[in-house]
């Protein structure tokens, strides 16, 4: 048989006598139907004039238009009330009714859980006409039933705008337990208890749960679903699953890995992206996070110099992006750089150390003893200075930059000259007469331009005045001398 009809059923034929036509009466199309006692409330109406309906599924016609004969009550015959079957089996069930021939256009529809079944369902209605009545059998078949087919099925028939409803046929599809909640992968702190949850449903119920840890059953006896397992803590990674059992068999959940949080692995591939005189831009590839998100990282910087005190500078930064600009470094210096990152458990070891260097810096001091005097015969200004005492880190001197500003009657004009590193004097042409010339000099290295010297002013008279007294800056001083000639 296609179905498992679990009822105490006395088989009886669908119709009192043999039906005309070619009705198949094999067991796959017509189930053994249990006899159910008791009558349904009637729905009263006349073939020509509908009366007030009662609640129920029986229609009792009154007198026919011929006037003499009372028609039998209209009702669906009782059928099997509850069909229990396994998933993927086929099932066929039916409704039957005998309708007096005076009724035309009878249609039977199938409904499941209050909704009409339309479209691609296997519903067949067969008519077996006789002299006075037509036997109608509406069959509904489902191939390879699924849990979603569970529910209450009924037939409805409309006659003269009245509705006749059959008794419900309950379809219960049973199968292996179906998980509604499975354990989830987690990252946990070592030796700290945590919970896992497993829930499965039938039918059939009950569903019982066994927990499995690393292939060993945790509970000797099953627990009713849903089940919460309190794991007392782990010292190493473990795999958990749950087994759900019911009368149909066993379903095993996915296995989930529970990882133990640990300190991260050290970062790798620390690289230099850009160096300046006082900063280095680095990046790194984070190591394994130890099953816990990175919180921050620490960049450690040691100066590689036999004379340095070996102290380590530490710069804390966010874990992302994996990049950091180390600032406040000395120019033209060598550094060893390492990176360590932390998660909630602790700090990783330091990455392999890498060497990096800063570039030359700009000079930090200005040229000394700047003197300026007017050479009127040549119509130029002579400038002299002393080479500054630059530190090694400033790099090699490549020259000087001379700024001279000419101011006269509200007009101001700045000019810049570049001279080579071997010079300690320069001449500039007089640009404007009857004006003040302000001169400043800066040393230049590959690392940039250093600070300018204090300004030295000289007055350039109109043509015909002669004086060779210089203007100058005293060596260490910061005065602003002016010599007017």
């Amino acid at each position: 048989a296609i179905t498992e009809a679990r009822e105490e059923a006395k088989p009886y034929p669908l119709f009192p006598g043999p039906l005309p036509g070619s009705l198949q009466t094999d067991h796959t199309s017509l189930l053994s139907l249990p006899h159910t006692s008791g009558y349904q409330p009637a729905l009263m109406f006349s073939p020509t004039q509908p009366g007030r309906p009662y609640t129920g599924n029986v229609a009792i016609p009154r007198v026919t238009s011929a006037g003499s004969k009372l028609l039998p009550p209209l009702a669906f015959k009782h059928t099997v009330g509850h069909i229990i079957l396994s998933e993927h089996k086929d099932v066929k069930f039916n409704c039957s009714i005998s309708v007096p021939n005076i009724y035309q256009d009878t249609t039977i529809s199938w409904w499941k859980d209050g909704k009409e079944l339309l479209g691609a369902h296997h519903a067949i209605t067969q008519f077996y006409p006789d002299d006075e009545v037509t036997a109608i059998i509406a069959s509904f078949s489902i191939t390879s039933v699924q849990r979603s087919d569970n529910g209450s099925y009924i037939c409805k028939m409309k006659i003269n705008n009245e509705e006749i409803v059959s008794d419900p046929i309950y379809i219960e599809v049973q199968g292996l337990p179906h998980f509604t909640k499975q354990p989830e992968s987690m990252n946990v702190t070592r030796n700290t208890a945590f919970n896992l949850t497993c829930q499965a449903v039938g039918p059939p119920e009950p569903v019982n749960i066994f927990w499995v840890q690393n292939s060993s059953r945790v509970n000797e006896q099953p627990e009713k679903s849903p089940s919460v397992l309190t794991v007392p803590g782990l010292t190493e990674m473990a795999v958990f699953s749950c087994e759900a059992h019911n009368d149909k068999g066993l379903t095993v959940s996915k296995g989930v890995q529970i990882n133990i949080k640990a300190i991260p692995s050290p970062p790798t591939e620390v690289s230099i992206h850009n160096s300046t005189a006082h900063s280095i831009l680095i990046s790194w590839v984070p190591g394994f996070d130890g099953y816990s998100p990175f919180r921050n990282c620490s960049v450690q910087v040691k100066e590689v110099d036999p004379l340095s005190n070996g102290s380590v500078m530490i710069f804390n930064t966010s874990a992302s992006p994996h990049m950091y600009q180390i600032k406040q470094l000395q120019a033209l210096a060598n550094y060893s750089i390492g990176v360590s990152c932390m998660n909630e458990i602790g700090w990783s070891a330091v990455s392999p150390w890498i060497l990096a260097s800063t570039t030359e810096g700009a000079p930090s001091v200005a040229p000394l003893n700047v003197t300026v005097f007017l050479n009127e015969s040549r119509d130029n200004v002579d400038i002299r200075w002393m080479k500054p005492l630059t530190k090694r880190q400033a790099g090699e001197l490549v020259g000087y930059r001379i700024s001279h500003v000419w101011q006269s009657a509200g007009i101001s004009k700045e000019l810049l000259e570049e001279v080579g590193q071997n010079n300690s004097r320069a001449q500039i042409s007089v640009q404007v007469h009857n004006a003040t010339c302000t001169v400043r000099i800066a040393a230049v290295t590959k690392g940039g331009v250093g600070p300018f010297s204090d300004p030295v002013k000289i007055f350039i008279p109109a043509h015909g005045w002669v004086d060779h007294a210089p203007s100058s800056t005293p060596a260490p001083g910061n005065a602003d001398p002016v010599l007017i000639i």
């Epitope: 030796n191 690393n214 945790v218 509970n219 006896q221 007392p232 803590g233 010292t235």
Partner: antibody
Framework: QIQLVQSGPELKKPGETVKISCKAS????????MNWVKQAPGKDLQWMGW????????TYADDFTGRFAFSLETSASTAYLQINNLKNEDTATYFC???????????WGQGTLVTVSA | QIVLSQSPAILSASPGEKVTMTCRSS?????MHWYQQKPGSSPKPWIY???NLASGVPGRFSGSGSGTSYSLTISRVEAEDAATYYC?????????FGGGTKLEIK
């Protein structure tokens, strides 16, 4: 509170049978397995096996197959250990212990001393 | 089946001393339980799943370990701790107990 109460001491002759009981209270008897543990005088603990109190299915450790039988009277929340054809080496204290997750025996009976002597 | 070896078999300590007893298994196990037994009494649950103290167990007791090596430590031994301590593994059937460590107080 949870309690496991075992029957009193037994003095038996070799070849005889003994049946000791373990009555549980304070929890749902059929939710947890019942384990049996043997301790010979001056010796260590030996796990004998357990019985599934829901299905009645017993599981025996290798050293305790054959003459040993676990059984239940579920309605009385009682587990039984029967030893047939007693031998001198069966002289020991037998404990019942309530099973739990991870085979943790959080509750023990007070023990039943079985002495086998001619 | 997994064999559990406890050492030392007998441990003698003075009150206030720190003592450690070990339990080694012939194969790796997931958890080790510990029970305390005094003469004439049934075993008492003592440490659950390697490191969790059972209800009523004093805080001076602790458990640790993983794989094949587990230990029970008493930070400051007291006279009432005199007993035999048994380990029991979870991770493989059949359940097995160790041979016990007898703690004597001087």
């Amino acid at each position: 509170q949870i309690q496991l109460v075992q029957s009193g001491p037994e003095l038996k002759k070799p070849g005889e049978t003994v049946k000791i009981s373990c009555k549980a209270s304070g929890y749902t008897f059929t939710n947890y397995g019942m384990n049996w543990v043997k301790q010979a005088p001056g010796k260590d603990l030996q796990w004998m096996g357990w019985i599934n109190t829901y299905t009645g299915e017993p599981t025996y450790a290798d050293d305790f197959t054959g003459r040993f039988a676990f059984s239940l009277e579920t309605s009385a929340s009682t587990a039984y250990l029967q030893i047939n054809n007693l031998k001198n080496e069966d002289t020991a204290t037998y404990f019942c212990a309530k099973g739990g997750h991870y085979a943790w025996f959080a509750y023990w009976g007070q023990g039943t001393l079985v002495t086998v002597s001619a | 089946q997994i064999v559990l070896s406890q050492s030392p078999a007998i441990l003698s300590a003075s009150p206030g001393e720190k003592v450690t007893m070990t339990c080694r298994s012939s194969s790796s196990v997931s958890y080790m339980h510990w029970y305390q037994q005094k003469p004439g009494s049934s075993p008492k649950p003592w440490i659950y799943a390697t490191s969790n103290l059972a209800s009523g167990v004093p805080g001076r007791f602790s458990g640790s370990g993983s794989g094949t090596s587990y230990s029970l430590t008493i930070s400051r031994v007291e006279a009432e701790d005199a007993a035999t301590y048994y380990c029991q593994q979870w991770g493989s059937n059949p359940r097995t107990f160790g041979g016990g460590t007898k703690l004597e107080i001087k």
